[in-house]
């Protein structure tokens, strides 16, 4: 960077190299060049010469003044015009940054995605700070009172193996940067209460031609949690409003749920689950589309989410795509 150049003098910033965005700042340049009494001192910002608000303080020093500085980062350097020198002589350079102190972190949330082996803690960091901001996540056992700290620049994954102090913890987050420090409220957690079951997916739909046509949705999860509550929402793609069906589910088996839908309409389905009685839900699963037949029954499944075909007795939809472990979305 610009800070690594060999200097023939000194450049400094008041009030500081990192300052609050929108402040008035002064950049000073002092020459110390052998056999040179500078005729003129020049300032450059990001390689472009500044023309205004430059004041000569004395023979070797000048000041550049900025009002309401709003750039997050800038590279500054200054040069001198020396007699008998054809080119300007570089004096020194400095990278400057402007931003904001951190907001108080809020909405601290910790969850354990089943099979992940981690407790994932997230929070709302508030407004963008524009400058390097670090977060320290404090995890304190309510049983042993032992406290662990984890440094991060965003969220944190804490191995559940490292949580040796029982099941109950306090979690809070400190945010800090060059302009300030803030601390969140404390969140009390019990490890058994924050598990989110392995993602549920809709794999297939089929409409069976009966006196009243009926659509069967096949859906599944790899969870081994015994008591799981799920919601399946569905609507015609032309509608704004979702219908929601609730299920108490045991994923020992693949689930099959029946719906009585209007004929010749394209529907969209999603599912999400939580451990029964617990706080956090999975994100909604990816959209699953199924068009009900006019008269001929229909099957839709994961591999054919863009095509619908007739199979004689039934017409089905099969959903496409693989689950990814980071397909998590909202958890509230």
């Amino acid at each position: 960077g610009i800070t690594n150049i060999n200097c023939s003098g000194h450049i400094w910033v008041e009030p500081a190299t990192i300052f609050k965005m929108g402040m008035n700042i002064s950049i000073y340049c002092q020459a110390a060049i052998k056999n040179c009494q500078p005729r003129k001192l020049h300032f450059y910002k990001n390689g472009i010469k500044e023309r205004f608000q430059i004041t000569r303080i004395n023979k070797t020093t000048a000041r550049l003044w900025y009002k309401n500085f709003l750039e997050p980062h800038a590279s500054m350097y200054c040069t001198a015009e020396c007699p008998k020198h054809f080119q300007e002589t570089l004096i020194c350079g400095k990278d400057i940054s402007s931003g904001y102190p951190p907001d108080i972190p809020d909405e601290v949330t910790c969850v354990i995605y089943e099979y992940s082996g981690n407790m994932t803690c997230t929070w709302n960091a508030g407004k963008l700070t524009y400058i390097d901001t670090k977060y320290v996540v404090h995890v304190k056992s309510l049983e042993t009172e032992e406290e662990q700290q984890y440094l991060t620049s965003s969220y944190i994954n804490i191995s559940t193996d490292s949580l040796q102090g029982g099941k109950k913890y306090l979690v809070w987050v400190q945010a800090a940067n060059a302009l300030g420090m803030e601390e969140s409220k404390q969140l009390q957690i019990h490890l058994d209460d924050i598990v989110i079951p392995s993602a549920a997916v809709i794999s297939r739909a089929e409409t069976i031609n009966a006196t009243v046509p009926k659509t069967i949705i096949y859906w599944d999860s790899q969870t081994t949690i015994e008591k799981v509550s799920c919601e399946m929402r569905y609507k015609a793609t032309t509608n704004q409003t979702w219908n929601v069906k609730e299920f108490d589910t045991n994923f020992t088996y693949v689930q099959q749920s029946e719906f009585y839908l209007e004929p010749n309409i394209k529907y969209v389905f999603q599912v999400r689950c939580q451990e029964t009685g617990k706080r956090y839900w999975q994100p909604w699963s990816s959209l699953f589309f199924h068009k009900t037949p006019e008269t001929v029954p229909q099957v839709t499944s994961k591999a054919f989410q863009h095509d619908t075909w007739n199979s004689g007795l039934t017409v089905a939809s099969i959903s496409t795509g693989h689950l990814t472990s980071d397909n998590r979305g909202d958890i509230g």
Epitope: Y115, S198, V201, S203, R204, Y218, W219, D220, S221, Q222, T223, T224, F251, T252, Y253, V254, Q256, S301, K302, S319, G321, H322, L323
Partner: nanobody, 128 residues
Framework: QVQLQESGGGSVQAGGSLRLSCTAS?????????MGWFRQAPGKEREGVAA????????YYADSVKGRFTISQDNTKNTVYLQMNSLKPEDTALYYC????????????????????WGQGTQVTVSS
């Protein structure tokens, strides 16, 4: 009742490829949780080769076949495939297809006792 029929076995030179198929009948494919491929060499225990979670296509492999074998499914044909590339003499075995009706912890996919239904097997022989 549930029936699994393997095909595609045979003899091949080391470095060659084979594609095994397992076609299921007697049930709706989508009601199975997992399908897996196992193998048993003479005098050895049956070992898990690969498995697939039917609902979303998540796949699992034994370390010894990772990067060489690929398991896939075709729900429209009620079929699971095992594409075997870069075959080695140590891949010689009787290959079985299996289906699991009930859920289990995914990391235990390779345990034969997790599976309820089995095919008769198809022989794969790799010569050096």
């Amino acid at each position: 009742q549930v029936q699994l029929q393997e095909s595609g076995g045979g003899s091949v030179q080391a470095g060659g490829s084979l594609r095994l198929s397992c076609t299921a009948s007697g049930y709706t494919f989508s009601t199975m949780k997992y399908m897996g491929w196992f193998r048993q060499a003479p005098g050895k225990e049956r070992e898990g080769v690969a498995a697939i979670w039917i609902a979303a296509g998540n796949t699992y492999y034994a370390d010894s076949v990772k990067g060489r074998f690929t398991i896939s499914q075709d729900n429209t044909k009620n079929t699971v495939y095992l594409q075997m590339n870069s075959l080695k003499p140590e891949d010689t075995a009787l290959y079985y297809c299996a289906a699991a009706r009930y859920g289990f912890v995914p990391s235990t996919w390779y345990l034969p006792e997790r599976y309820n239904y089995w095919g008769q097997g198809t022989q794969v022989t790799v010569s050096s």
